[in-house]
Amino acid sequence: CKAMHVAQPAVVLASSRGIASFVCEYASPGKATEVRVTVLRQADSQVTEVCAATYMMGNELTFLDDSICTGTSSGNQVNLTIQGLRAMDTGLYICKVELMYPPPYYLGIGNGTQIYVIDPEPCPDSDF
């Protein structure tokens, strides 16, 4: 297993609709034809997998059906979007990139993106 540098933004603020997007960029030492991207969430020293996708030559990442993630790729950049976030989902989201093929296998883990989620205030009742 060889190490690889992965860069991602330090902080992202989710939209009022609970959507957060960030770019995960990896320094590929060669031309990988098969890449696996995993988003991990770290909160209270616990790490959980949020979503993962393996992609090849296309520009759209395909996630499992119950995934809250969507994404696209362009060169060595992956544009990730996480949806359905609530205040309790605030945490550090880490991008993990694996170059699956061709050998050698490379693994890179980013420093994480702190995503802040603020639940929208409920609209006050109106008399109109």
């Epitope: 759209e60 059906d65 969507t70 699956m100």
Partner: antibody, heavy 115, light 106 residues
């Protein structure tokens, strides 16, 4: 030029298995997914699963999980789809298709399940 | 699973007509891809990533849309366009196709 050439038609008995091959040429086999698509007579298209020929990573449609197995042989640039426990509703044409965009397709393999 | 519903399922039109086929997704998808299939043949990629024409596809074909609503438009039907058209999504597994739209000669 890119080509996907599939094996010939099969007639199989209920409960048996069938293995369909898809030989790729004209491109780097390990650079693109190989997808498998079912089309029953007079019906639409149904994605069965895909394999990344380099690593062998597979994704399956749950409707076929447990009955379909996707494999590949990189030395011959050939992908295989094996379907087991066959029943009459498996009678269909099975296509292989290349990549994320399904930009090249095999000619199709007719599988008839009949006693 | 993401369901794709095409409308109409059947369409009768004449050479020279402008026709539009709609593909509605049960959940928002990033892109839609379109295929054409003629009887006894394998499907053929027409449009990928919603609006990009595949190699060799005539410019009378176009695609548009976003979110859950997508369309395929043929600006002026030619005799060779009479076929069945399918939309497809690959935002989430399993990849799914629409049920198809059969375009027939009026």
């Amino acid at each position: 030029q890119v080509q996907l050439v599939q094996s010939g038609a099969e007639v199989v008995k209920p409960g048996a298995s069938v293995k369909v091959s898809c030989k790729a040429s004209g491109y780097t086999f390990t650079s693109y997914w190989i997808n498998w698509v079912k089309q029953a007579p007079g019906q639409g298209l149904e994605w069965m699963g895909r394999i990344a020929p380099g690593s062998g990573t597979t994704y399956y449609n749950e409707m076929f999980t447990g009955r379909v197995t996707l494999t590949r042989d990189t030395s011959t640039s050939t992908a295989y789809m094996e379907l087991s426990s066959l029943r009459s509703e498996d009678t269909a044409v099975y296509f292989c298709a290349r990549g994320d965009y399904f930009d090249y397709w095999g000619q199709g393999t007719m599988v008839t399940v009949s006693s | 699973d993401i369901q794709l519903t095409q409308s109409p399922s059947f369409l009768s039109a004449s050479v020279g007509d402008r026709v539009t086929i709609t593909c509605s997704a049960s959940k928002s998808v990033s892109y839609i891809h379109w295929y054409q299939q003629k009887p006894g043949k394998a499907p053929k990629l027409l449009i990928y990533d919603t609006s990009t024409l595949a190699s060799g596809v005539p410019s009378r074909f176009s695609g548009s849309g976003s979110g859950t609503e997508y369309t395929l438009t043929i600006s002026s039907l030619q005799p060779e366009d009479f076929a069945t058209y399918y939309c497809q999504q690959r935002t989430t597994y399993p990849l799914t196709f629409g049920q198809g739209t059969k375009l027939e000669i009026k």
